[in-house]
């Protein structure tokens, strides 16, 4: 555990401790003194730390930042793999904890859990075969991807796999079933009549998190999985296969867990820390595993098993990738191969394993019981070329600038933690583990979390996901800072991400989208409700179609695809850093929060329209059952004038009154806190955002009101429309409480 | 240097066996498909079998269907071919090539090209 404070107060000690009631008027008077004392001092040390020269301040941390620091650091930490539960990531942390130590933080400390990991078996290989008819293999899927040169001699290298497959060995016919979403099972099962029970499925990654392939499959009967890459998804045109480029190669293959785990970290210890004491679950009833064998494969060896699929034709365009095969949706293979059955061979088995979170201390000058959280995660599939380690580089040189300030006798106002994460890769485990046990602190101390994973996707503007309540200071931070962009020399970011990511409802300023999950805030956000965000470099979504970044996840993503083809100057990877570490900076640093809820009100608004509009495709229903939004518009409008308000009141009150100032924080800390409901969304009890929520459909994508949006989901199917309806009603009843709760939170205290 | 070197060849007595290695070095080995191609006397150049980069697939010429075995250390950079119950027809001086797609399997192809060939070791099987 870590321990920021020393709560050992002497003077309130003593005060319990009363002598003689001849004493009062010197405790009294003495009393007044140390009033006075302590209110002097608070604003002689809120002022010495952050409101002499706050420009300066700032300034000095950013000008700190070294585009060559991270890049040494990149090098650094991808020489070999550190995949989660490994010694050599193991060494890593205690290399982080030692570095951080020496940059000045003010304590280090690792903390470890057991949690349930998966591995493939070292002798015993997963892989895809063709059977014919007499049951031999004539035609086997890669054991391992080719390794890049350079890297041929590098052990514990893991072969690609699907990270928490049971066991199994299915044969059966082929069904492709295009992306595996929920709309592509109701395209083929509905439309097209199909069935997939009995059946191994293949789909190709892309548009949604895999885990949500995986369980969309198995409500379809599907034996088992194979996810393959296609170069329409991961090729970009008229770019090379690395290493001549940044595409991926024919035997390059995305590895990834297919947990759904719904927000509760470990699978075995749902709700609590995975220490040494901690009750686990058997597996069979584990958190979130699949119940059918999956395996990842390249597209070359897809090719192989898709050239000879039969069945039915591919419904239109959108089901076909960029393989020369006629993407027939089977089942089974064409005429002369329709003996040949597809079979898995998967043997991978998962175990209880310990991971370390490093977890570094800037303590908070003026309010050290109020947290500032920046974390990203150090495990990675391989290299972790940009995933992670492009982020944790960044965070190296953030903390080391920061460590540069405190050495010079400058303290945060408040306190900034620091944290390198374990088994982000298999379900967040790490971040999540951690909360668990801390979350008594971080609901009551938590301020904000910014997250630091991968800090490219690409090199073309920057993307950012951010609770409303952060859009104004990222809105600010980036007009302050210059543009890395050609063609945009002199200009500021926020000029450069205008103009390439405009907002699709707002003109003149740039895109901000939902947070949704797939990374480590989700347990601070989307559980405790502490105000989040992230931030890094992406592609061009228009003309760049494929998903995430070619090499995701493969033994290819290395040092050498990022100095060679992503940001050779690193210029990218320090934009980030001072986006990263500037929102920390002000967020630890400004005396007034840098929230601001009208903003939030806004998108309540936006919210509330969006899910009228998708209920409004019923109206009949709607009559029938009687559903309104009356309440909820009732509730947005009443957040909007308290919220309104509120700002008011934030820009006029007296910011030397050290307890006016206190309950004015609190207010805009505690906001985010108000939107959470403690019994969670249906079925997923860890996901207590009312506002937002990960898709059900697709864990990477932010959901608004999703306790509405997925009561109204495919409602035209259910077998009892009452109930169905009846549902609607209770989420907007829900969604109503929490909106105008939250508005009273910011109402005036007395 | 990029090269290949094979070894083991020699003069065997029909229904023996003879182990012939192909050692690789200057280039990513264990990145590649390989090759063993054999010559005999005054004859073309006859493909004999292929295994892919990572050894999940390997193809033989009917010919040796069930009699010889591909196999590869990539930690050896080393590629080998078991040959059992040699035949007189067998006689040839084997080479070992490498394929030129980098992990692409060409097994089933009905031509190859090599882009890096060995200089040869002789298999004699004469009673």
């Known amino acids: 555990m870590w321990n920021l404070l020393h709560e050992t107060d002497s003077a309130v000690a003593t005060a319990r401790r009363p002598r003689w009631l001849c004493a009062g008027a010197l405790v009294l008077a003495g009393g007044f003194f140390l009033l006075g004392f302590l209110f002097g001092w608070f604003i002689k040390s809120s002022s010495e730390a952050t409101n002499i020269t706050p420009k300066h301040n700032m300034k000095a941390f950013l000008d700190e930042l070294k585009a060559e620091n991270i890049k040494k650091f990149l090098h650094n930490f991808t020489q070999i793999p550190h995949l989660a539960g490994t010694e050599q990531n193991f060494q890593l942390a205690k290399q982080i904890q030692s570095q951080w130590k020496e940059f000045g933080l003010d304590s280090v400390e690792l903390t470890h859990y057991d949690v349930l990991l998966s591995y493939p078996n070292k002798t015993h290989p997963n892989y895809i075969s063709i059977i014919n008819e007499d049951g031999n293999e004539i035609f086997n899927t890669s054991l391992f991807e080719p390794p890049p040169a350079g890297y041929e001699n590098v052990s514990d290298i893991v072969p690609p796999f699907s990270a928490f497959s049971p066991q199994g060995m299915p044969e059966g016919d082929l069904v492709y079933v295009n992306y595996a979403r929920t709309e592509d099972f109701f395209k083929l099962e509905r439309d097209m009549k199909i069935n997939c029970s009995g059946k191994i499925v293949i789909a190709r990654y892309g548009k949604v998190f895999r885990g949500n392939k995986v369980k969309n499959a198995q409500l379809a009967g599907a034996t088992g999985v194979i996810l393959y890459s296609d170069p329409a998804d991961y090729f970009a045109p008229g770019v090379k296969s690395y290493p001549d480029g940044w595409n991926l190669p024919g035997g390059g293959v995305q590895r990834g867990n297919i947990l759904n785990l719904n927000g509760a970290g470990d699978p075995l210890t749902p709700g609590y820390p995975a220490n040494e004491y901690a009750y686990r679950r058997g597996i069979a009833e584990a958190v979130g595993l699949p119940s059918i064998p999956v395996h990842p494969i390249g597209y070359y060896d897809a090719q192989k098993l898709l050239e000879k699929m039969g069945g039915s034709a591919s419904p239109d365009s959108s089901w076909r990738g960029s393989l020369k095969v006629p993407y027939n949706v089977g089942p089974g293979f064409t005429g002369n191969f329709s003996t040949q059955k597809v079979k898995m061979h998967i043997h991978s088995t998962s175990e209880v394993t310990r991971i370390y979170n490093v977890i570094g201390t800037l303590r908070g000058a003026v309010e050290p019981d109020r947290y500032v959280i920046l974390g990203g995660h150090r495990d990675s599939w391989v290299f972790g070329g940009i995933d992670p380690q492009s982020g944790a580089a960044v965070v190296h040189e953030i903390v080391r600038s920061f460590g540069t300030l405190k050495k010079e006798g400058w303290r945060p106002r408040r306190t900034i933690l620091f944290a390198s994460w374990d088994a982000e890769e298999f379900g967040l485990l790490g971040s999540t583990e951690w909360a668990e046990e801390n979350s008594r602190l971080l609901q009551e101390r938590g301020v904000a979390y910014i997250n630091a994973d991968s800090s490219i996707e690409g090199n073309y503007t920057l993307r950012v996901d951010c609770t409303p309540l952060m859009y104004s200071l990222v809105y600010n931070l980036t007009k302050e800072l210059e543009s890395p962009d050609e063609g945009f020399e002199g200009k500021s970011l926020y000029e450069s991400w205008t103009k390439k990511s405009p907002s699709p409802e707002f003109s003149g300023m740039p895109r901000i989208s939902k947070l949704g999950s797939g990374n480590d805030f989700e347990v601070f956000f989307q559980r405790l409700g502490i105000a989040s965000g992230r931030a890094r470099y992406t592609k061009n979504w228009e003309t760049n179609k494929f998903s995430s970044y070619p090499l995701y996840h493969s033994v290819y993503e290395t040092y050498e695809l990022v100095e060679k083809f992503y940001d050779p100057m690193f210029k990218y990877h320090l934009t980030v850093a001072q986006v990263r570490g500037g929102m920390v900076f002000e967020l630890a640093n400004s005396v007034v929060l840098p929230f601001d809820c009208r903003d939030y009100a806004v998108v309540l608004r936006k919210y509330a329209d969006k899910i009228y509009n998708i209920s409004m495709k019923h109206p009949q229903e709607m009559k029938t059952y009687s559903v309104s939004f009356d309440s909820l518009f009732s509730a947005v409008k009443n957040f909007t004038e308290i919220a309104s308000k509120f700002s008011e009141r934030l820009r006029d009150f007296d910011k030397s009154n050290p307890i006016l100032l206190r309950m004015m924080n609190d207010q805009l800390m505690f906001l985010e806190r108000a939107f959470i409901d403690p019994l969670g969304l249906p079925d997923r009890p860890f996901y207590r955002h009312v506002i937002y929520a990960p898709s059900s459909h697709n864990k990477y994508a932010g959901e608004s009101f999703p306790g509405i949006y997925d009561a109204l989901f495919d409602i035209e199917s259910k077998v009892d429309p009452s109930q169905a309806w009846g549902e609607v009603k209770r989420q907007i009843s829900i969604a109503t409480f929490t909106v105008q709760a939250a508005a009273e939170t910011l109402s005036e205290v007395a | 240097e990029v090269q290949l070197v094979e070894s083991g060849g020699g003069v065997v007595q029909p229904g023996r066996s003879l182990r012939l290695s192909c050692a690789a070095s200057?280039?990513?080995?264990?990145?590649?498909?390989q090759h063993w191609v054999r010559q005999a006397p005054g004859k073309g150049l006859e493909w004999v079998a292929y295994?892919?980069?990572?050894?999940?697939?390997?193809y033989y010429a009917d010919n040796v269907k069930g009699r010889f075995t591909i196999s590869r250390d990539n930690s050896k950079n080393t590629l080998y071919l078991q040959m059992n119950s040699l035949r007189a027809e067998d006689t040839a001086v084997y080479y070992c090539?490498?394929?030129?797609?980098?992990?692409?399997?060409?097994?089933?192809?009905?031509?190859?090209?090599?882009?890096?060939w060995g200089q040869g070791t002789m298999v004699t099987v004469s009673s």
């Open positions: 295994i892919s980069y990572d050894a999940s697939n390997k």
């Open positions: 200057g280039f990513s080995f264990s990145g590649y498909g």
């Open positions: 090539a490498k394929d030129p797609a980098w992990g692409l399997r060409l097994g089933e192809s009905s031509s190859y090209d090599f882009d890096i």
